[in-house]
Every structure is written in C-alpha cells, then in structure tokens.
C-alpha cells in the first residue's frame, strides 16, 4: 500500500488488545481545506516504541488503515480511499510492547466535518439562581454548535456535562456551583447538526471560586499603646488559603478571595466617622480606644461570612497628665496640646457604668496656647460631669478627624465631678483614746476615693481649745485613719479631716471635739 | 470463554415495543463492537444495528428511527429498544460480540442462542 492512500488489508500486527486504560484518546477529524482532511489525537502513556495506526470502516462495510509511525497527527486527500461525503467511523490502534490499545471511535462524514474551537478568549463567570453562569463570544465563522463542560473539584476526578445546544453570537453554559470548595471548568464545541463531527480541544482552565468565601480564620494581638498615643494591630495567623484543582494551581484568576478589615471605632462617638474598611495586609495604628474587627472574606460572587473581634479600650491612666480648673463659669481642662491644628475628642463616662454611656464632645481644630496647653472649657448648665462622682475621661487627638486609622490617644484618667471638695469631704470621723497622751482618729473613706488617682491626701487638723494652737497632719489617701501624740490630758481639743485633690483643697468635716482624761493615781 | 445470553423477546400486536437485553459474559477486549442480527425463516441472516466500544451506532435503513441500539460497559450488556413493530419485524434476535476489524468490518466471533420476537397484526 502506499503512505498516501487507506490500506485495505489487515493491519501488519496481531490484534491483541491490551485493556489499557492508557492509550490513545481525544482523536478528532475533520476537513482542512476543500479536498485535505486531517485527524490528530493525544496518547497517554510511554511513547517509545509506539506505532499509530488509524482505522477507518466505510459505510460499505470495508475497512483500511493509515500507518502513521510515531506522529499523532495525519493528513490524507480525498483521493486516499475514505468516502469523505458518507459516514465513515474512525480509530486510532497503538500498537506498542506487542499490545494494540485502542482510541475510542468517531462515526462522522470528513467532507460536513469542520474543525471547531473551543471557547477562545474571556469567559465571564456570573452567579444565576444558585448556578454558575459561564458567557463567552462565539469563535469566528462557528455559529451552531454542541456545547460539553467538565469540572472538578481539588478531591473530586472531572465529570462531564451538557451546555445543549448554541445558535448565537454569544454562547453560555448553566454549570453547578459549590457551595464550599473551588471548581474547575473547561469546555468544548463541535459543530451542531454534524453527525459525529469531532470535539474541539478542551478550552483553557476556568477557575470558579466557591459560592461561600472561606470563612477566615485570624487571629489578632494588639502592641502597648507607645508614647504617641498609638497601637499596632498585629496579624497573628494568615488566613487559610482556598485549596484549588489541578489546573487552577498557581495562577487562579477568578478563585482569589481577598479579606477586608473593618474597623468600628467604638470610643468618642461623636466624630464623623466610625468605620473603615482596610486591606488586611496593612495593618493599621490604633489609639488606645475600643474597638470591634471584622475580617470580611469575599470572591467574585460577593462577600462571605465575617469573623469579629473586640479590642478593649487601653485602660493604662496617667493621673498627671491633666489640670482641670473650677472657675464661678465652668470647668477648663487643660493638657499638653500635640501638635498645631489637632481636633480633640473627650470623652467622659461614670465609672462602673456601661460603656454605652459614654458622653463626649468634639473640639475645633486648636492650636497649643503659649504654655503649650490645649484646652477644652465648659460651664455649669451644660450637666456635663455634673453630678458628684466619678468619671473615667479619655482625650482622643488628630490632625485629620475623618480618618479613622489617624486617632490617636492623648491621656487617659479619672475625674470626679460636681462640687468635688464638699462631697469629698470624709464623714463619720471618730476619735478613741490610744494612751495617755495620744488618741486614734479614723473616718470613713472620701467619695473621692473610688475614683483612681483623684485623692491626693487626707489632712487631719487638730486644734487645741486652751492655746488655739493648731496642727496638721497629711495622711495617705490610702490611709482612714492617724495617731496624734503629743496631748496633753484635760485639755480640750477638735478634730477634723479634710480630703483634698491635685488641685483642690477639700471641706474639713465637721469638728470633732473630744479631750484625755485626767489620770488620777490610787 | 464468552457468554451472550439473550432475552426480553415475545409475542405483541404491531404497533407495540419490546426490549431486548444481552448480557455478555468472559470477555477479556474493551474494544468490541456488539450487534444484533435477525433471521426470518427461509431468509437470510440480517444486520439489525451495532454499537462500538465509544458509542458510535449503525442501523439497518429497514429499522432507523424505530429501534435504539445502547450499551451499559459496566454490566457488558447490550439493549435493543424495539418500538412501532410491524409484522415483517418477526424473526429470532441474536446478539453478536466483534473484538476484531478486519477489511472487512467487525469480525463477530462470538454468538448468543436468540430470542423470538413475533409481531402480529
């Protein structure tokens, strides 16, 4: 027989087929110009040794052979023997280590038989009624045509599905979503109406991420709030990466969930913004407010579920840091300002109270007075920190107030409102004889004592009646009670105690009035 | 050693259907063309339909768009789905098993016993 032309004779090998799952596959055949045809296939498995032969039975009944030797591709005109206008079926047999393995067959008529593209260019993947909907332009000059998909999932092996019939410009495919794990899609075409035209090649991998982004599993620690009022917010544990098929390994357009930080700045409620969304690779500076996160995984079909975290309020006090002035007008506060043109946020709540009652109050942007001061002043009627006891108060600062990230902590500390030195005042002072010549007082706790750092100390004043002399003694505010010695028996003396702060002095209580007996030797 | 056992053949009144299953036993080849032939007393043996190991199918002109030729490879069984019969339908069904092609088509060396199928107006 010659290379050129179907061989109508048995194949110059025995017929012993393998059961090979390997071999060749995938053969497709069709008409390349007005008279040439070619048919081309993949084989799978080791291919030294191998020898091709394509088969060919016509309609007729007869059957021939092409040898093609090692190549997977082989082309013939329409005078090598095949009927081209009648339904031919086509084979390849491999005949390799004295074995024939077998292709599976194409029925088909080579002149109809043209040679389809798979879907070339963009595929557009969109979500449609819990099904995924894949859209791309119809190859040039191949309108009508068989649709087929496959996928599979990282675990799963390909399975093959059915996109029916196409007749437009534009082709699409209804296609199953995942709920949870990552697809791979690929399709193919071949020419509608064309009784067993070939398949084209797969098309290039579509990669479709699942329905529901991961949900993302961080974790986060928080770094000492520094000198300037700020804290890092750390990334401890990445997020888990979405485990993707075979082909969809390395790049992935289209699986890629990306994860947002939000940012819900739950102190000084009063400014205008009091939420960001960040990429979480960038971290972010916090002050030293409280805050709740939120990692938000998303893909191309939207957001998924959020994981949320709260960031306490740094409770680190510095008792110093603030003045605060009681004027027949009001209450000025007074700090060291931070920088030219800082808006201020303070922010004031009952100690011991919810944190939803936090009240507080935007300043205008300030630039630092002479002292290098900043200031924020109100008056009697406004109630603010009006009633008598104990407040937490935060000073908030930044240059740039609309920006959430740029907030930084100014001082964190106690205050106690309303007339401060009258309710401060310690009742129930009680005097007891201790020895001949000295008595213990003691008195209840100042009010102004539950209120951190408030109460500087407790003077105790002892006035004797006789000689009008007076003493004072300072006794730690943490300290209810003194020792006075010193006494002289039968004289009369008053006691009285008085709290005072860093920068008021208190109300003396009530005086007390008490004397040492006489001692009277038997 | 390769097994074809026929059934699901019958008596029915033209216009009816029957289905023909053959069940394929021993067979070592993937690649085989399975068929069915009918034989008609004092008339020669005639190709019905053939499916190929990839699905491919043949018919005779006398039965296209009436009978459906389809395979099940896991159970290596065959089917003939036999609708709108007609009294010239009636012969012996007997499935064919070809693991070879020759020059001159399947070669089909293994044969089941048949099963009538008798269609009366």
């Known amino acids: 027989c010659r290379t050129s032309e179907c061989c109508f004779q048995d194949p110059p090998y025995p017929d012993a087929d393998s059961g090979s799952a390997s071999g060749p596959r995938d053969l497709r055949c069709y008409r390349i110009s007005s008279d040439r045809y070619e048919c081309s296939w993949q084989y799978e498995g080791p291919t030294a040794g191998v020898s091709h032969f394509l088969r060919c039975c016509l309609s007729s009944g007869r059957c021939c052979y092409f040898a093609a030797g090692s190549a997977t591709r082989l082309q013939f005109s329409d005078q090598a023997g095949v009927s081209v206008l009648y339904t031919v079926t086509l084979w390849v047999e491999s005949w390799a280590r004295n074995q024939t393995e077998k292709s599976p067959e194409v029925t088909l008529q080579l002149y109809n038989s043209v040679k389809y593209e798979p879907p070339l260019g963009d595929i557009k993947v969109s979500k449609l009624a819990g099904q995924l909907r894949m859209e791309w332009e119809t190859p040039d000059n191949q309108v009508g045509a068989e649709v087929q998909f496959r996928h599979r999932t990282p675990s799963s092996p390909w399975k093959l599905g059915d996109c029916g019939p196409q007749d437009d410009d534009t082709e699409s495919c209804l296609c199953p979503l995942e709920m949870n794990v990552a697809q791979e899609f690929q399709l193919r075409r071949r020419q509608l109406g064309s009784q067993g035209s070939s398949w084209s090649k797969w098309s290039s991998p579509v990669c479709v991420p699942p329905e529901n982004p991961p949900q993302p599993q961080v974790r986060f620690s928080v770094e000492q709030l520094g000198q300037d009022g700020r804290r890092r917010l750390t990334l401890k544990e990445q997020p888990t990466q979405l485990e993707l098929p075979e082909g969809c390994q390395g790049l992935a357009p289209g699986t890629e969930v990306t994860y947002r930080l939000q940012l819900h700045m739950l102190s000084c409620p009063c400014k205008a913004k009091a939420t960001r969304t960040l990429h979480l690779g960038k971290m972010p500076y916090l002050s030293g407010a409280a805050y709740n996160v939120a990692v938000i995984s998303s893909n191309q079909f939207g957001p998924g579920l959020n994981q949320t975290w709260h960031i306490p309020a740094d409770t680190h006090t510095e008792p110093v840091a603030l003045n605060i002035s009681v004027g027949t007008n009001g209450t000025t506060m007074y700090w060291p300002a931070r920088a030219q043109s800082m808006t201020y946020c303070i922010e004031w709540q009952p100690v011991g109270q919810d944190g939803g009652l936090a009240t507080c109050s935007l300043t205008a942007p300030q630039d630092p007075d002479p002292a290098g001061m900043a200031t924020y002043s109100w008056s009697r009627e406004s109630g603010a920190m009006g009633q008598e006891k104990c407040y937490y108060i935060t000073i908030f600062a930044s240059a740039h107030p609309e920006k959430l990230t740029l907030w930084s902590t100014v001082l964190s500390t106690y205050h106690f409102g309303g007339n401060a030195s009258a309710a401060g005042t310690p009742h129930h002072v009680s005097v007891k004889n201790h020895s001949l010549d000295s008595v213990s007082v003691d008195w209840a706790p100042s009010l102004l004592s539950t209120c951190p750092g408030v109460l500087k100390e407790y003077v105790v004043r002892c006035r004797d009646e006789d000689s009008k002399q007076v003493s004072e003694h300072p006794v730690q505010p943490t300290e209810t009670q003194v020792t006075l010695s010193g006494l002289r028996a039968g004289v009369a003396y008053t006691v009285q105690v008085r709290a005072d702060t860093a920068w008021l002095r208190g109300v003396w209580s009530q005086p007390q009035r008490f004397s040492i007996e006489v001692q009277v030797s038997d | 050693q390769v097994q074809l056992v026929e059934s699901g053949g019958g008596a029915v009144q033209a216009g009816g259907s029957l289905r023909l299953s053959c069940a394929a036993s021993g067979l070592t080849s993937r690649h085989y063309v399975m068929a069915w032939f009918r034989q008609a007393p004092g008339i020669e043996r005639e190709f019905v339909a053939s499916?190929?190991?990839?699905?491919?199918?043949y018919y005779a002109d006398s039965v296209k768009d009436r009978f459906t030729i389809s395979r099940d490879n896991a159970e290596n069984t065959v089917y003939l789905q036999m609708n709108s019969l007609k009294p010239e339908d009636t012969a012996v069904y007997r499935c064919?098993?070809?693991?070879?092609?020759?020059?001159?088509?399947?070669?089909?060396?293994?044969w089941g016993q048949g099963t009538q199928v008798t269609v009366s107006s």
């Open positions: 064919a098993v070809g693991t070879k092609i020759g020059t001159m088509g399947p070669r089909y060396d293994y």
């Open positions: 499916i190929w190991w990839g699905g491919s199918t």
